[in-house]
């Protein structure tokens, strides 16, 4: 997955104190045993920093070497820094691991901007604040990179949680999560709660604060409120879904729904922004501008380049509209909607103005590779990647940032016809091109 705009994120102290969870509605369908309940050891196991990614602690090798690893649902390789780099405090030292096995094969991953390359091998991997298991997994030992690692981000590798089809060098390289499920009794499901701080955090605040939770093998009730609504995974490569309608402050964008998914729509924790196809982005920005027309902002702001600042505590959230994405439901002709607030799509930025100001970047941007539901979306919700049942669930996150007037929402059902027509079928000839990095 891609960097700069394609790496997240911010994290930290959520809208509600993490100890104070709102009660959950109980009208959900029952699940198979062992997949729900409390996963105390995994709650709050993510950290992160604005625009730089959410990471989990992992150990690799024997004896275990501890590394922070970026959680990325938009790629499928487990890749770690394995050579000195100016931005890395530590790296994977294969020669110190008695369990490392060399696969004698290289891997090269170019992005739109930047790249990494390395050597493939396998080793024993575990997640200290995850399931109590150790698995032998494929590891790409990154020996060279350009614009991949981020100065001050505090992570040293990337955990691609998507499917084998988009693994590099090819789909024969089994992704980490597939190995985990095959080798253990961990159910084929994980869930993510990414907690945006709502304000910028400095390095020490990041290290001391909570960035969210990755629950491996289950769903934790305490991390969401209300009901979970599921949308089918259209195809197992990226976590591809189908958007059937888009509304800005309740006003339908009225576009052919194929445009919303041109050429795909994916859920990607490794992208900061909500990224929209060109036509959709232009229509959405026009609508957001109209809704917030009592104040005008420069074009550079809408391009995600310039920051806009307000006196601390006076950000006029009320002038910015809510954005609703309607997703295909599990039942024929049924959809549900997820609604985000400006608190999600205006991203706090640090170190630019005085401490008397709150400054933000517009975190919706244009895409040439389809819709990307990045952190801007995910920070509003608890997102369940139910691989076993080929579906993704959304519920309102217990840590999302909101105000006293509006909250993020997951609501349904809505009647929507011909939803299958909303999916775009990528011509086979284009696919290899599309996978060489995402602009």
């Amino acid at each position: 997955t891609q960097h700069g705009i394609r790496l997240p994120l911010r994290s930290g102290l959520g809208g509600a104190p993490l100890g104070l969870r709102l009660p959950r509605e109980t009208d959900e369908e029952p699940e198979e045993p062992g997949r729900r309940g409390s996963f105390v050891e995994m709650v709050d196991n993510l950290r992160g920093k604005s625009g730089q990614g959410y990471y989990v602690e992992m150990t690799v090798g024997s004896p275990p070497q501890t590394l922070n690893i970026l959680v990325d649902t938009g790629s499928s390789n487990f890749a770690v820094g394995a050579a000195p780099h100016p931005f890395l405090h530590r790296y994977y030292q294969r020669q110190l691991s008695s369990t490392y096995r060399d696969l004698r094969k290289g891997v090269y991953v170019p992005y739109t901007q930047g790249k990494w390359e390395g050597e493939l091998g396998t080793d024993l991997v575990s997640i200290p604040h995850g399931p109590n298991v150790t698995v032998r997994a494929n590891i790409a030992a990154i020996t060279e990179s350009d614009k991949f690692f981020i100065n001050g981000s505090n992570w040293e590798g990337i955990l691609g949680l998507a499917y084998a089809e988009i693994a590099r060098p090819d789909d024969s390289l089994e992704p980490f999560f597939d190995s985990l499920v095959k080798q253990t009794h961990v159910p084929n499901l994980f869930s993510l709660q990414l907690c945006g701080a709502g304000f910028p955090l400095n390095q020490s605040e990041v290290l001391a604060s909570v960035g969210g939770s990755m629950i491996i093998g289950g769903i934790d009730h305490s991390l969401y409120t209300g009901s979970l609504w599921y949308t089918p995974i259209r195809r197992e490569w990226y976590y591809e879904v189908i958007i059937v309608r888009v509304e800005i402050n309740g006003q339908d964008l009225k576009m052919d729904c194929k445009e919303y998914n041109y050429d795909k729509s994916i859920v990607d924790s490794g992208t900061t922004n909500l990224r929209l196809p060109k036509k959709v982005f232009e229509a959405a920005v026009k609508s957001i501008k109209a809704a917030s027309s009592t104040e005008k902002f420069p074009d550079g702001f809408w391009l995600g380049e310039q920051l806009v600042c307000w006196q601390a505590g006076t950000t006029p959230w009320n002038i910015f509209p809510v954005i609703s994405l309607y997703l295909m439901g599990e039942v024929t002709n049924q959809s549900f909607r997820i609604t985000i607030l400006p608190q999600q799509y205006l991203r706090p930025v640090e170190d630019v103005a005085t401490s008397q100001d709150d400054c933000y970047k517009f975190a919706i941007s244009q895409s040439s590779t389809g819709t990307v539901m990045g952190a801007v979306i995910m920070e509003g919700f608890y997102v369940v990647f139910d691989r076993a049942r080929k579906r993704i669930g959304f519920a309102v996150s217990a840590c999302h940032v909101h105000d006293e007037f509006r909250t993020a929402a997951v609501e349904g059902p809505f009647v929507t016809l011909d939803m299958e027509d909303c999916g775009y079928n990528i011509p086979q000839t284009d696919e290899s091109t599309l996978m060489t990095g995402r602009a």
Epitope: T294, G300, E305
Partner: antibody, heavy 120, light 108 residues
Framework: QLQLQESGPGLVKPSETLSLTCTVS??????????WGWIRQPPGKGLEWIGN???????YYNPSLRGRVTISVDTSKNQFSLKLSSVTAADTAVYYC????????????WGRGTLVTVSS | EIVLTQSPATLSLSPGERATLSCRAS??????LAWFQQKPGQAPRLLIY???NRATGIPARFSGSGSGTDFTLTISSLEPEDFAVYYC??????????FGGGTKVEIK
């Protein structure tokens, strides 16, 4: 063509309120293409941004002056105004009104400026 | 807060010479930077916007370059009317608030 002209007293006593008006001629202040702003320049020194206003009344102020500064707009008179309270000698400056054009980014048209001296 | 540092403070040159003025930002401002010219007793005048675009009516001898943190205003051949004070201003953080301290171009 559009012109801006500052007006107001050239002498203000310490602790009083400085009041200036900028009259826009040659075009409507209610254009959606512009913000309107105030900048000042103490004698022999550099430029300091004071604040901006949109015709709807939306304002932005320099954090260093917040609490003392108020900018308002009167679309019927095609004017916008500056009030700076509790002035001291440090507020002695040439005060300019300007148009924030080029996509609300750059001060592309300026008034001639008016010198305001704070002295008893 | 983003600080703009202009150098040199004073530049002494003769008409016909090339003037190179520098503006350095304490952190990246992308290309959101303007240059203004101010003559004694006059209001500033916008010369360059978005780092390299000449404002309406500005002669071609004025050019701007740079992005990120380092910016340059070049006057290819100084005319007598070009002797003035030049200011840079960043608008990466909006509303535009920060001016540099100025560079005085004087006759040698």
């Amino acid at each position: 063509q559009l012109q801006l002209q500052e007006s107001g007293p050239g002498l203000v006593k310490p602790s009083e309120t400085l009041s200036l008006t900028c009259t826009v001629s040659g075009g409507p202040i209610s254009s959606s293409s512009y913000y309107w702003g105030w900048i000042r320049q103490p004698p022999g020194k550099g430029l300091e941004w004071i604040g901006n206003i949109y015709y709807s009344g939306s304002t932005y102020y320099n954090p260093s002056l917040r609490g003392r500064v108020t900018i308002s707009v009167d679309t019927s008179k095609n004017q916008f105004s500056l009030k700076l309270s509790s002035v001291t000698a440090a507020d002695t400056a040439v005060y300019y009104c300007a148009r924030l054009g080029h996509g609300y980014n750059y001060f592309d048209l300026w008034g001639r400026g008016t010198l305001v001296t704070v002295s008893s | 807060e983003i600080v703009l540092t202009q150098s040199p403070a004073t530049l002494s040159l003769s008409p016909g010479e090339r003037a190179t003025l520098s503006c350095r930002a304490s952190q990246s401002v992308s290309s959101y930077l303007a240059w203004f010219q101010q003559k004694p007793g006059q209001a500033p005048r916008l010369l360059i916007y978005d780092a390299s675009n000449r404002a309406t009516g500005i002669p071609a001898r004025f050019s701007g370059s740079g992005s990120g943190t380092d910016f340059t205003l070049t006057i290819s051949s100084l005319e007598p009317e070009d002797f003035a004070v030049y200011y840079c201003q960043q608008v990466y953080v909006w509303p535009p608030r920060t001016f540099g301290g100025g560079t005085k171009v004087e006759i040698k």
